[in-house]
C-alpha cells in the first residue's frame, strides 16, 4: 500500500485527559466487575469432566483455534486490500483481526445453546496462544504497510490479565457447581441481575466517555469493514467447523468464538503502537467493531431462536431422532445450562 493522506477528519480533537477521567476509571472498574460475574455464572454451567474431554480430544478446540488465528487475521488483511484502505486504517483493522477471542462469545454461545465447555476452553486457549500468535501474526501481516516493530507492542500483561479474569471466576463457578449445587441457582440469578445493571451502567458511561468521538471513526469504508469482519468470522467459523464434521452445538460455538474479538486488547495495542496524531479517531475503531459484533451476534441469536421456535413438527421429530443417535440434545437444554453429549465429533446439524 502506498503512502496516503491520513484519514482522520479535520475536526476531530481528542477530549483532554481522555482515558484518565473519573468516568473512565468507573467504566474500567464496572467492566471488570461485570466480567467477573459473567464468568462466574458461565462457570456454573460447566463441568471439569467435559473440559477434560475437550482437552484430551481437542478436535473442536483445534478447529476453533485455526478459525481464530487463521480466518480473522486473513479476513482483516484481505478487507484492507479489497477496500484499499490507508495504511493506518489497515493496521488498525489488522490489530483487531489478530486479537484473541473475546468474552462476549461466551455469552453468545450460551444464548445459541452452544457448548459452554468448548466456549470457555477456546477463549482461554486463544488468549493463551495470543502470547505467541499475536506478535507472529502482526509481524507477518503488517510487513509492507508498517516499518515499526508492531510485534513489540503486544500487551503481554493485558493478555495475562484477560486469562486471569476468565479462569478465576470460571473455576469458582465450576467448583461451586460440583461442591455446592444448591447455591448455583442463586448465583446465576444474582449474577444475571448484576450483569443487567452493569450493562446499563456500561452503556451510559461509554456514551458519556466516548460521546461524539466515535462518529469520527464512522467513515463509510470503516463501517463496511467493521460490519463485514465479525460477519465473515461468524460465517467462516461455522463453515470450517461444518467441513470438519463438528456437531451443531460445537459449530455454533466455534462460529461465535471466531467472530468475537477481544476489543480491549485491540484498543491497548492501538493506544501504545501509534502516535495519537496518526491514529486519531481510528482509536475508536475497536469500539465500532464491538458495536457490530454485538449487533450481528444478537441478530444471529434472534434468528436461531426463531428457527428453534418455528421448526415444523417433522423437523422436531428428526431432531429428537438425531439427538438420540448422536447424543446431542439441542432443544433439551439441562436446567443448569449444560447439554448432554459434549463430544464435538458427530457430524450432525
Amino acid at each position: 500500500m502506498e503512502a496516503h493522506n491520513a484519514s482522520a477528519p479535520f475536526n476531530f480533537t481528542l477530549p483532554p485527559n481522555f482515558g484518565k477521567r473519573p468516568t473512565d476509571l468507573a467504566l474500567s472498574v464496572i467492566l471488570v466487575f461485570m466480567l467477573f460475574f459473567i464468568m462466574l455464572s458461565l462457570g456454573c454451567t460447566m463441568e471439569f469432566s467435559k473440559i477434560k474431554a475437550h482437552l484430551w480430544k481437542p478436535k473442536g478446540l483445534a478447529i476453533a483455534l485455526v478459525a481464530q488465528y487463521g480466518i480473522m487475521p486473513l479476513t482483516a488483511f484481505v478487507l484492507g486490500k479489497v477496500f484499499r484502505l490507508k495504511n493506518i486504517e489497515a493496521l488498525a483493522i489488522l490489530v483487531c483481526g489478530c486479537s484473541p477471542g473475546g468474552n462476549l462469545s461466551n455469552v453468545f454461545s450460551l444464548a445459541m445453546k452452544g457448548d459452554m465447555n468448548l466456549s470457555i476452553v477456546m477463549t482461554t486457549c486463544s488468549t493463551f496462544c495470543a502470547l505467541g500468535m499475536m506478535p507472529l501474526l502482526l509481524y507477518i501481516y503488517s510487513r509492507g504497510i508498517y516499518d515499526g516493530d508492531l510485534k513489540d507492542k503486544v500487551p503481554y500483561k493485558g493478555i495475562v490479565i484477560s486469562l486471569v479474569l476468565v479462569l478465576i471466576p470460571c473455576t469458582i463457578g465450576i467448583v461451586l457447581k460440583s461442591k455446592r449445587p444448591q447455591y448455583m441457582r442463586y448465583v446465576i440469578k444474582g449474577g444475571m441481575i448484576i450483569i443487567l445493571l452493569c450493562s446499563v451502567a456500561v452503556t451510559v458511561l461509554s456514551a458519556i466517555n466516548v460521546g461524539k468521538s466515535i462518529m469520527f471513526a464512522m467513515t463509510p469504508l470503516l463501517i463496511a469493514t467493521s460490519s463485514l469482519m465479525p460477519f465473515i468470522g461468524f460465517l467462516l467459523g461455522y463453515v470450517l467447523s461444518a467441513l470438519f464434521c463438528l456437531n451443531g452445538r460445537c459449530r455454533r460455538t466455534v462460529s461465535m468464538e471466531t467472530g468475537c474479538q477481544n476489543v480491549q486488547l485491540c484498543s491497548t495495542i492501538l493506544n501504545v503502537a501509534f502516535p495519537p496524531e496518526v491514529i486519531g479517531p481510528l482509536f475508536f475503531f475497536p469500539l465500532l467493531y464491538m458495536i457490530f459484533q454485538l449487533g450481528e451476534g444478537l441478530l444471529l441469536i434472534a434468528i436461531f431462536w426463531c428457527y428453534e421456535k418455528f421448526k415444523t413438527p417433522k423437523d422436531k421429530t428428526k431432531m429428537i431422532y438425531t439427538a438420540a443417535t448422536t447424543e446431542e440434545t439441542i432443544p433439551g437444554a439441562l436446567g443448569n445450562g449444560t447439554y448432554k453429549g459434549e463430544d464435538c465429533s458427530p457430524c450432525t446439524a
Epitope: 496516503h4 493522506n5 482522520a8 475536526n11 481528542l14 495504511n87 493506544n271 486519531g280
Partner: antibody, heavy 126, light 108 residues
Framework: QVQLQQSGAELVKPGASVKLSCKAS????????IHWIKQMSGQGLEWIGW????????KYSEKFKDKATLTADKSSSTVYMELNRLTSEDSAVYFC???????????????????WGQGTTLTVSS | EIVLTQSPAIMSASPGEKVTITCRAS???????LHWYQQKSGVSPKLWIY???NLASGVPARFSGSGSGTSYSLTINSVEAEDAATYYC?????????FGGGTTLEIK
C-alpha cells in the same frame, strides 16, 4: 542527542520545484511524526503537514495540500518536502520538527513539537 | 480553524521587570493543547512551556504560564537580558496545529 539536520539554503526560479530534506538521528525514526512548518520573513509560523515514517501516512494542511509533497527514505532516516510551482510567496524559512510522543499512549498526547531542525531558507527569485 | 492572536506584537522591558504576554484564541482551546515556544533571531524555535503551565527542560523558573478557554498568558517574573526573543503560542485542535503571530520582547 536528538537531531534534525536540514539541507542548505536554496535559490530557485519561479515556476520551478524544490526538494528540501530533513535527516533524523538519535531516535527511532519510525516511531514519530515529522512535521514541516513555514516561516516567512519577519512573520509567524505556519503548519504545513506531517509524515509518519512508520506507516507512510501523511497529513497536509488544507492550504498546502496542492503545494507540498512529503516523502521519506527510511534507510537514511530522511524526510523530504517537495514544493512545486514556486512563487515569491513561497520564499521563507522551512523548519522540520519532531512531534512529541508519550509512549504511555494515546491518552497522553499533548500535541507539541519537542525538537526542531535548524531551518532551510528558500528564496524564489528570477 | 482556531486563530491565535498574541498581544502585544512588540514590547520592551527593563531587566528585573515583570512581563506578561497574552494569547487569545478565536474559540476555546484545551489547556492541555496550548504551548509556548521561544525563538531567538536566526535560530529555530524552542519548546518553552507545554500544556499551558509546564516548563520545558532547561527553562528558568522565572517563566510561568497560565490560562484556560480562550485566554492564555506567559509571564516572566523578573526579566533578564537573555530573555530577548520572539515568543509564539501554539495550539492543537481538529487535526490542525496553529501558531500565534508572535510577541517580540526587547530588553532596554
Amino acid at each position: 542527542q536528538v537531531q534534525l539536520q536540514q539541507s542548505g539554503a536554496e535559490l530557485v526560479k519561479p515556476g520551478a520545484s524544490v526538494k528540501l530534506s530533513c535527516k533524523a538521528s538519535d531516535f527511532t525514526f519510525t516511531e514519530y511524526t515529522i512535521h514541516w512548518i513555514k516561516q516567512m520573513s519577519g512573520q509567524g509560523l505556519e503548519w504545513i503537514g506531517w509524515f509518519y515514517p512508520g506507516s507512510g501516512d501523511i497529513k497536509y494542511s488544507e492550504k498546502f495540500k496542492d503545494k507540498a509533497t512529503l516523502t521519506a527514505d527510511k534507510s537514511s532516516s530522511t524526510v523530504y518536502m517537495e514544493l512545486n510551482r514556486l512563487t515569491s510567496e513561497d520564499s521563507a524559512v522551512y523548519f522540520c520538527a519532531r512531534h512529541m510522543r508519550d509512549f504511555r499512549g494515546f491518552y497522553y498526547g499533548r500535541f507539541y513539537f519537542d525538537y526542531w531542525g535548524q531551518g532551510t531558507t528558500l528564496t524564489v527569485s528570477s | 480553524e482556531i486563530v491565535l492572536t498574541q498581544s502585544p506584537a512588540i514590547m520592551s522591558a527593563s531587566p528585573g521587570e515583570k512581563v506578561t504576554i497574552t494569547c487569545r484564541a478565536s474559540s476555546s482551546v484545551s489547556s492541555s493543547y496550548l504551548h509556548w515556544y521561544q525563538q531567538k533571531s536566526g535560530v529555530s524555535p524552542k519548546l518553552w512551556i507545554y500544556s499551558t503551565s509546564n516548563l520545558a527542560s532547561g527553562v528558568p523558573a522565572r517563566f510561568s504560564g497560565s490560562g484556560s478557554g480562550t485566554s492564555y498568558s506567559l509571564t516572566i517574573n523578573s526579566v533578564e537580558a537573555e530573555d530577548a526573543a520572539t515568543y509564539y503560542c501554539q495550539q492543537y485542535s481538529g487535526y490542525r496545529w496553529t501558531f500565534g503571530g508572535g510577541t517580540t520582547l526587547e530588553i532596554k
